[in-house]
Protein backbone atom coordinates (compact mmCIF):
# COMPACT_ATOMS: atom_id res chain seq x y z
CA UNK A 1 0.00 0.00 0.00
CA UNK A 2 1.06 3.54 0.89
CA UNK A 3 4.03 2.30 2.93
CA UNK A 4 5.50 0.52 -0.05
CA UNK A 5 5.20 3.61 -2.24
CA UNK A 6 6.82 5.78 0.40
CA UNK A 7 9.76 3.37 0.70
CA UNK A 8 10.15 3.31 -3.07
CA UNK A 9 10.15 7.11 -3.19
CA UNK A 10 12.88 7.35 -0.56
CA UNK A 11 14.90 4.69 -2.37
CA UNK A 12 14.62 6.56 -5.67
CA UNK A 13 15.66 9.79 -3.99
CA UNK A 14 18.80 8.09 -2.66
CA UNK A 15 19.65 6.73 -6.08
CA UNK A 16 19.13 10.15 -7.64
CA UNK A 17 21.31 11.80 -5.01
CA UNK A 18 24.08 9.29 -5.64
CA UNK A 19 23.82 9.93 -9.37
CA UNK A 20 23.95 13.69 -8.79
CA UNK A 21 26.99 13.31 -6.53
CA UNK A 22 28.73 11.25 -9.20
CA UNK A 23 28.00 13.86 -11.87
CA UNK A 24 29.19 16.70 -9.65
CA UNK A 25 32.34 14.75 -8.86
CA UNK A 26 33.12 14.36 -12.55
CA UNK A 27 32.04 17.75 -13.79
CA UNK A 28 33.59 20.04 -11.21
CA UNK A 29 33.60 23.76 -11.81
CA UNK A 30 36.65 25.13 -13.60
CA UNK A 31 37.60 27.02 -10.44
CA UNK A 32 37.55 23.85 -8.33
CA UNK A 33 39.24 21.77 -11.00
CA UNK A 34 42.10 24.25 -11.31
CA UNK A 35 42.87 23.69 -7.62
CA UNK A 36 44.19 20.24 -8.48
CA UNK A 37 46.95 21.69 -10.66
CA UNK A 38 48.85 24.99 -10.77
CA UNK A 39 46.25 27.13 -9.06
CA UNK A 40 47.61 30.49 -10.23
CA UNK A 41 47.42 29.49 -13.88
CA UNK A 42 44.88 31.65 -15.67
CA UNK A 43 44.10 33.65 -12.52
CA UNK A 44 43.85 37.41 -12.72
Amino acid sequence: GGGGSKHKCVQNSLVNNETLESIMNTLESEEDFRKYFYYLEGSK
Epitope: N25, T26, D32, K35, Y36, F37, Y38, Y39, E41
Partner: antibody
Protein backbone atom coordinates in the same frame (compact mmCIF):
# COMPACT_ATOMS: atom_id res chain seq x y z
CA UNK B 1 66.22 22.35 -8.09
CA UNK B 2 62.53 21.46 -8.41
CA UNK B 3 61.95 17.98 -7.01
CA UNK B 4 59.72 15.69 -4.98
CA UNK B 5 61.04 12.77 -2.92
CA UNK B 6 58.85 9.93 -1.69
CA UNK B 7 59.48 7.83 1.41
CA UNK B 8 57.71 5.44 3.76
CA UNK B 9 57.35 2.37 1.57
CA UNK B 10 58.08 -1.13 2.76
CA UNK B 11 56.70 -4.63 3.25
CA UNK B 12 53.43 -4.86 5.12
CA UNK B 13 50.90 -7.61 5.83
CA UNK B 14 47.41 -7.55 4.30
CA UNK B 15 44.97 -5.55 6.40
CA UNK B 16 47.69 -3.40 7.93
CA UNK B 17 48.44 0.30 7.40
CA UNK B 18 51.26 2.38 6.00
CA UNK B 19 51.86 6.11 5.57
CA UNK B 20 53.80 7.48 2.63
CA UNK B 21 55.37 10.93 2.55
CA UNK B 22 56.45 13.16 -0.30
CA UNK B 23 58.83 16.03 0.44
CA UNK B 24 58.77 18.87 -2.09
CA UNK B 25 61.49 21.44 -2.71
CA UNK B 26 62.50 24.07 -5.22
CA UNK B 27 58.98 25.41 -5.85
CA UNK B 28 56.10 27.05 -3.99
CA UNK B 29 54.40 23.86 -2.80
CA UNK B 30 51.25 25.67 -1.64
CA UNK B 31 50.42 26.78 -5.21
CA UNK B 32 50.12 23.28 -6.63
CA UNK B 33 47.71 20.39 -6.49
CA UNK B 34 49.54 17.14 -5.74
CA UNK B 35 48.84 13.61 -6.92
CA UNK B 36 49.72 10.03 -6.12
CA UNK B 37 50.14 7.56 -9.00
CA UNK B 38 51.06 3.91 -8.62
CA UNK B 39 52.56 1.23 -10.82
CA UNK B 40 52.28 -2.47 -10.03
CA UNK B 41 55.39 -4.50 -10.93
CA UNK B 42 55.61 -4.90 -14.71
CA UNK B 43 52.32 -3.03 -15.23
CA UNK B 44 51.14 0.38 -16.36
CA UNK B 45 50.39 3.58 -14.46
CA UNK B 46 47.30 4.07 -12.30
CA UNK B 47 46.19 7.42 -10.89
CA UNK B 48 45.35 7.02 -7.19
CA UNK B 49 44.37 10.33 -5.62
CA UNK B 50 44.78 14.11 -5.66
CA UNK B 51 44.62 16.96 -3.17
CA UNK B 52 44.10 20.60 -4.06
CA UNK B 53 46.74 23.26 -3.43
CA UNK B 54 45.11 24.26 -0.14
CA UNK B 55 43.95 20.81 0.97
CA UNK B 56 40.27 21.70 0.67
CA UNK B 57 39.45 19.36 -2.23
CA UNK B 58 40.33 15.68 -2.64
CA UNK B 59 39.49 12.98 -5.14
CA UNK B 60 40.18 9.24 -5.17
CA UNK B 61 40.18 6.34 -7.58
CA UNK B 62 37.40 3.86 -6.80
CA UNK B 63 39.99 1.17 -6.09
CA UNK B 64 41.24 3.02 -2.98
CA UNK B 65 38.20 5.01 -1.90
CA UNK B 66 37.43 4.54 1.80
CA UNK B 67 40.84 2.97 2.48
CA UNK B 68 43.37 5.65 1.46
CA UNK B 69 43.50 9.25 2.66
CA UNK B 70 45.54 12.00 1.06
CA UNK B 71 46.65 15.03 3.07
CA UNK B 72 49.27 17.76 3.00
CA UNK B 73 51.12 20.10 5.31
CA UNK B 74 52.01 23.24 3.38
CA UNK B 75 54.10 24.55 6.27
CA UNK B 76 56.34 21.48 5.87
CA UNK B 77 56.12 21.24 2.06
CA UNK B 78 55.02 17.65 2.49
CA UNK B 79 52.34 15.45 0.94
CA UNK B 80 51.04 12.29 2.66
CA UNK B 81 49.19 9.14 1.74
CA UNK B 82 47.66 7.17 4.60
CA UNK B 83 46.95 3.65 3.38
CA UNK B 84 44.68 1.46 5.51
CA UNK B 85 43.28 -2.06 5.02
CA UNK B 86 46.03 -2.82 2.53
CA UNK B 87 45.52 -5.59 0.00
CA UNK B 88 47.89 -7.63 -2.15
CA UNK B 89 46.69 -5.67 -5.19
CA UNK B 90 48.00 -2.45 -3.61
CA UNK B 91 51.54 -3.73 -4.16
CA UNK B 92 53.17 -1.14 -6.39
CA UNK B 93 55.68 1.64 -6.77
CA UNK B 94 53.99 4.80 -5.49
CA UNK B 95 54.90 8.05 -7.20
CA UNK B 96 54.19 11.56 -6.03
CA UNK B 97 53.55 13.97 -8.91
CA UNK B 98 52.97 17.70 -9.15
CA UNK B 99 49.89 18.96 -10.92
CA UNK B 100 51.42 21.62 -13.10
CA UNK B 101 50.51 24.03 -15.86
CA UNK B 102 48.34 22.65 -18.62
CA UNK B 103 46.69 20.24 -16.16
CA UNK B 104 49.69 17.90 -16.57
CA UNK B 105 51.83 15.95 -14.12
CA UNK B 106 55.05 17.83 -14.71
CA UNK B 107 57.31 16.76 -11.83
CA UNK B 108 57.62 13.15 -10.65
CA UNK B 109 59.53 11.59 -7.79
CA UNK B 110 61.62 8.41 -7.97
CA UNK B 111 58.87 6.51 -6.18
CA UNK B 112 58.65 4.38 -3.03
CA UNK B 113 57.85 0.67 -3.19
CA UNK B 114 54.97 -0.81 -1.21
CA UNK B 115 54.72 -4.58 -0.96
CA UNK B 116 51.65 -6.13 0.65
CA UNK B 117 52.36 -9.75 1.48
CA UNK B 118 51.76 -12.23 4.28
CA UNK C 1 35.54 6.34 -16.66
CA UNK C 2 37.36 7.44 -19.79
CA UNK C 3 39.21 4.49 -21.28
CA UNK C 4 42.48 5.24 -23.07
CA UNK C 5 43.79 2.83 -25.72
CA UNK C 6 47.14 2.90 -27.48
CA UNK C 7 48.47 1.35 -30.68
CA UNK C 8 50.81 -0.29 -31.20
CA UNK C 9 51.59 -1.78 -27.79
CA UNK C 10 55.12 -2.53 -28.98
CA UNK C 11 57.15 -0.69 -31.59
CA UNK C 12 60.60 -1.88 -32.68
CA UNK C 13 62.25 1.01 -34.50
CA UNK C 14 65.47 1.69 -36.36
CA UNK C 15 67.80 4.36 -35.01
CA UNK C 16 67.38 7.60 -36.94
CA UNK C 17 63.98 6.58 -38.30
CA UNK C 18 60.62 8.08 -37.28
CA UNK C 19 58.18 6.47 -34.87
CA UNK C 20 54.50 7.12 -34.26
CA UNK C 21 52.20 6.14 -31.40
CA UNK C 22 48.43 6.48 -31.51
CA UNK C 23 46.16 7.11 -28.53
CA UNK C 24 42.38 7.03 -28.51
CA UNK C 25 39.95 7.99 -25.74
CA UNK C 26 36.52 6.48 -25.21
CA UNK C 27 35.00 9.98 -25.14
CA UNK C 28 36.00 13.48 -26.09
CA UNK C 29 38.75 15.03 -23.98
CA UNK C 30 37.61 18.59 -24.69
CA UNK C 31 36.81 20.26 -21.38
CA UNK C 32 34.28 23.04 -20.85
CA UNK C 33 37.06 25.63 -20.94
CA UNK C 34 37.76 24.61 -24.55
CA UNK C 35 41.07 22.92 -23.77
CA UNK C 36 41.95 19.28 -24.35
CA UNK C 37 43.94 17.84 -21.48
CA UNK C 38 45.84 15.03 -23.14
CA UNK C 39 49.48 14.52 -22.20
CA UNK C 40 52.26 12.12 -23.14
CA UNK C 41 54.75 10.63 -20.69
CA UNK C 42 57.96 8.73 -21.25
CA UNK C 43 59.21 6.08 -18.85
CA UNK C 44 62.73 4.85 -19.46
CA UNK C 45 63.67 1.44 -18.00
CA UNK C 46 64.02 1.64 -14.21
CA UNK C 47 63.06 5.31 -14.14
CA UNK C 48 59.96 7.26 -13.07
CA UNK C 49 57.68 8.73 -15.75
CA UNK C 50 58.67 12.05 -17.33
CA UNK C 51 56.33 14.58 -18.94
CA UNK C 52 56.93 15.09 -22.66
CA UNK C 53 53.82 16.78 -24.06
CA UNK C 54 50.79 18.48 -22.48
CA UNK C 55 47.54 19.81 -23.93
CA UNK C 56 47.98 17.66 -27.06
CA UNK C 57 50.96 19.42 -28.60
CA UNK C 58 52.88 21.55 -26.08
CA UNK C 59 56.39 20.30 -25.38
CA UNK C 60 57.42 20.44 -21.74
CA UNK C 61 60.60 22.32 -20.91
CA UNK C 62 63.76 20.48 -21.88
CA UNK C 63 62.00 18.06 -24.21
CA UNK C 64 63.76 17.77 -27.60
CA UNK C 65 61.85 19.03 -30.64
CA UNK C 66 62.12 15.51 -32.10
CA UNK C 67 58.97 14.85 -30.05
CA UNK C 68 55.68 16.27 -31.28
CA UNK C 69 52.04 15.74 -30.43
CA UNK C 70 48.90 16.21 -32.49
CA UNK C 71 45.25 15.28 -32.59
CA UNK C 72 41.84 16.43 -31.38
CA UNK C 73 38.73 15.16 -29.65
CA UNK C 74 39.34 11.46 -29.16
CA UNK C 75 42.30 10.72 -31.45
CA UNK C 76 45.89 11.71 -30.68
CA UNK C 77 49.37 10.95 -31.93
CA UNK C 78 52.90 11.19 -30.55
CA UNK C 79 55.62 11.34 -33.17
CA UNK C 80 59.39 10.97 -32.78
CA UNK C 81 61.00 12.38 -35.90
CA UNK C 82 64.32 10.54 -35.54
CA UNK C 83 64.59 7.88 -32.88
CA UNK C 84 67.71 7.91 -30.69
CA UNK C 85 68.96 5.22 -28.31
CA UNK C 86 67.86 7.43 -25.41
CA UNK C 87 64.23 7.14 -26.53
CA UNK C 88 63.90 3.48 -25.54
CA UNK C 89 61.17 2.99 -22.97
CA UNK C 90 57.42 2.97 -22.52
CA UNK C 91 55.24 5.87 -23.66
CA UNK C 92 51.90 6.60 -22.02
CA UNK C 93 49.09 8.92 -23.01
CA UNK C 94 47.04 10.33 -20.15
CA UNK C 95 43.85 12.33 -19.80
CA UNK C 96 43.29 14.92 -17.07
CA UNK C 97 40.00 16.20 -18.45
CA UNK C 98 37.77 14.21 -16.13
CA UNK C 99 38.02 12.22 -12.90
CA UNK C 100 39.25 9.62 -12.52
CA UNK C 101 42.36 10.52 -14.49
CA UNK C 102 43.36 7.62 -16.70
CA UNK C 103 46.40 6.39 -18.61
CA UNK C 104 46.76 4.38 -21.76
CA UNK C 105 48.29 0.90 -21.39
CA UNK C 106 51.63 2.12 -22.70
CA UNK C 107 53.62 1.55 -25.88
CA UNK C 108 57.03 -0.07 -25.58
CA UNK C 109 59.60 1.45 -27.94
CA UNK C 110 62.82 -0.43 -28.49
CA UNK C 111 65.54 -0.60 -31.11
CA UNK C 112 65.47 -3.21 -33.88
Amino acid sequence: QVQVVESGGGVVQPGRSLRLSCAASGFTFSNYGMHWVRQAPGKGLEWVTVISYDGSNKNYADSVKGRFTISRDNSKNTLYLQMNSLRAEDTAMYYCARGGSGFAFDIWGQGTMVTVSS
Amino acid sequence: DIVMTQTPLSSPVTLGQPASISCRSSQSLVRSDGNTYLSWLQQRPGQPPRLLIYKISNRFSGVPDRFSGSGAGTDFTLKISRVEADDVGVYYCMQTTQFPFTFGPGTKVDIK
